[in-house]
């Protein structure tokens, strides 16, 4: 429970307003009012406050609002979201792009990963999908932060939007992410013709089935060694090494690079020795010639 | 269901000493501001004072000022109106009511306790 | 303090018209802060509107509010039986708290 002390008159608090930053922590406590501080939120971030001041500002926002801020209150905290935790934002119904733009300028700068992933999934559900606007606001305010949201927000991403994103902005996004992304992509740049499909769907390629890999591969792509080690293992592992010599192009000799890493190391596991002898790049650890190979998944699978 | 229920009206003598009660249920009086707002006979609302649930800040109007006091027990959910020298501008029906943060309006009152200072 | 003053005094109608009633602050308030009650003779307030426009919980759509800055009105569109009654604003963006000195809606 919180320690209660009197407000002395002198010190009563009728504006928030720069003298407030002489006041100390238990003076701020006993005569700053929650509602008179919410209701005047918009003159708070001009206040130099001490980061101890903050955290006291804080919890009269916490008292006044344990159900979670109202954006009126959210869209002027200033440097005071730097004091929130994701358990705070997680409360919080955000719908104005005003508002997230706001809070993302003053995030910069700071370890704030974790409340910036929340804020975005808060906006998100808040305006119902990530709309064009919304994917807009996090490309020119937040590179990167598309890969934020979990892949069930991604999943109302509608294909429409797809375009406008950058291959920056999927630089942080694991295979889930992309899993739920590459789909769209596909549908969005379908029309496309093969050198210019290739350019746009790369970035999401992380999310690609084993079928349009070996689609790709027909399409004399000349897949850069960057994108390959992005795609799912399970999606390059079914490649026969003819398929990844096309598929590479050029850039196949970088598979000896690469060779201890995943996914070329699993790839070259499951390849015959003689078959990647024809590389002539001298990968070794393939299946030596003569021996049989067993995929024992299938047998268990219909067993 | 919300309910309050105030307490501790009377008759009571210029300078003399009243204390109200307003019992809470139906709600996280905890995590509630509540108000106190008088009426006198024949005349409008008057805002007299509020709580905050947590640190207990109070504000008051500045015709109450230094004489009454409004406090709470959170253990109790209770609210209380301590007010002193009374004099006979003080009559008047006192409500307790609870103050609504997110609509930012007074949302629930009590019935209301008539305070009668007179000699 | 912020001082607001209502208007008309009283307001004589019959049921099924129009009621509009006023309410002026000394200083802009913003919107979010501006509460409207209803009192009937012998009862404690209750909340009609909050945030100048949005209706509370089980307030018929015939009230109404609007306005911004310094003016805000409250409207009835067409008066029942049970509307006639004393309507007070209320600010809450600086203490104290005030509230006008109410319109009396009456029967004509």
């Known amino acids: 429970d919180v320690e209660r002390t009197t407000c002395p008159p002198e010190k009563e608090v009728h504006e928030i307003d720069e003298s407030l930053i002489f006041y100390k922590k238990r003076e701020l406590e006993a005569c700053v009012d929650a509602a008179l501080l919410a209701a005047q939120m918009d003159r708070v971030d001009a206040i130099p406050f001490t980061y101890e001041q903050l955290d006291v500002l804080k919890h009269k926002l916490d008292e006044l609002y344990p159900q979670g801020y109202p954006e009126s209150v959210i869209r002027h905290l200033g440097h005071l979201f730097l004091k929130m935790s994701p358990e705070d934002i997680r409360k919080w119904n955000v719908t104005s792009l005003e508002t997230l733009k706001a809070l993302l300028k003053v995030s910069k700068g700071h370890e704030m990963s974790a409340q910036v992933a929340t804020l975005i999934d808060r906006v998100v559900v808040g305006r119902g999908q990530l709309d064009k606007d919304t994917a807009d606001t996090l490309t020119a305010f937040c590179p990167g932060c598309l890969c934020s949201l979990s892949p069930e927000r991604l999943s109302s991403v509608p294909p429409s939007i797809i375009g406008a994103v950058r291959p920056q902005d999927l630089d942080t996004c694991g295979p889930r992410q992309l899993d739920v992304l590459y789909p769209k992509a596909r549908l969005a740049f379908q029309n496309m013709s093969g050198s210019e499909y290739f350019v746009k769907i790369r970035p999401f390629l992380g999310g690609a089935p084993t079928e349009d890999l070996k689609a790709l591969s027909q399409q004399n792509v000349s897949m850069d060694l960057a994108t390959f080690m992005k795609l799912r293992r399970e999606a390059v592992l079914p490649l026969s090494v003819a398929e990844v010599q096309k598929l590479l192009g050029p850039h196949v000799e970088g598979l000896k690079v690469e060779e201890q890493h995943s996914p070329v190391r699993d790839w070259i596991l499951k390849q015959r020795q003689d078959d990647l002898d024809t590389l002539g790049l001298g990968l070794q650890g393939g299946i030596p010639n003569g021996y049989l190979i067993l995929d024992l998944s299938v047998r268990e699978a219909l067993s | 269901e919300v309910q309050l229920l105030e307490s501790g009206g009377g008759l009571v003598q210029p300078g003399g000493s009243l204390r109200l009660s307003c019992a809470a249920s139906?709600?996280?009086?905890?995590?509630?501001?509540m108000s106190w707002v008088r009426q006198a006979p024949g005349k409008g609302l008057e805002w007299v004072s509020n709580?905050?649930?947590?640190?207990?800040?109070?504000n008051y109007a500045d015709s109450v000022k230094g004489r009454f006091t409004i406090s709470r027990d959170n253990s109790k959910n209770t609210l209380y109106l301590q007010m002193n020298s009374l004099r006979a501008e003080d009559t008047a029906v006192y409500y307790c009511?609870?103050?609504?943060?997110?609509?930012?309006?007074?949302?629930?009152w009590g019935q209301g306790t008539l305070v009668t200072v007179s000699s | 303090e912020i001082v607001l003053t209502q208007s008309p005094g009283t307001l004589s109608l019959s049921p099924g018209e129009r009621a509009t009633l006023s309410c002026r602050a000394s200083?802009?308030?913003?919107?979010?802060?501006l509460a409207w009650y209803q009192q009937k003779p012998g009862q404690a307030p209750r909340l009609l509107i909050y945030?100048?426009?949005s209706r509370a919980t089980g307030i018929p759509d015939r009230f109404s509010g609007s306005g911004s800055g310094t003016d805000f009105t409250l409207t009835i569109s067409r008066l029942e039986p049970e509307d006639f009654a004393v309507y007070y604003c209320?600010?809450?963006?600086?203490?104290?708290?005030?509230f006008g000195q109410g319109t009396k809606v009456e029967i004509k």
């Open positions: 009511a609870r103050y609504n943060a997110y609509q930012i309006g007074l949302d629930y």
């Open positions: 139906g709600f996280t009086f905890t995590q509630t501001y």
């Open positions: 709580i905050s649930p947590t640190y207990s800040t109070t």
């Open positions: 200083q802009s308030v913003s919107s979010s802060y």
């Open positions: 945030g100048a426009s």
């Open positions: 209320q600010q809450a963006l600086g203490y104290p708290h005030t």
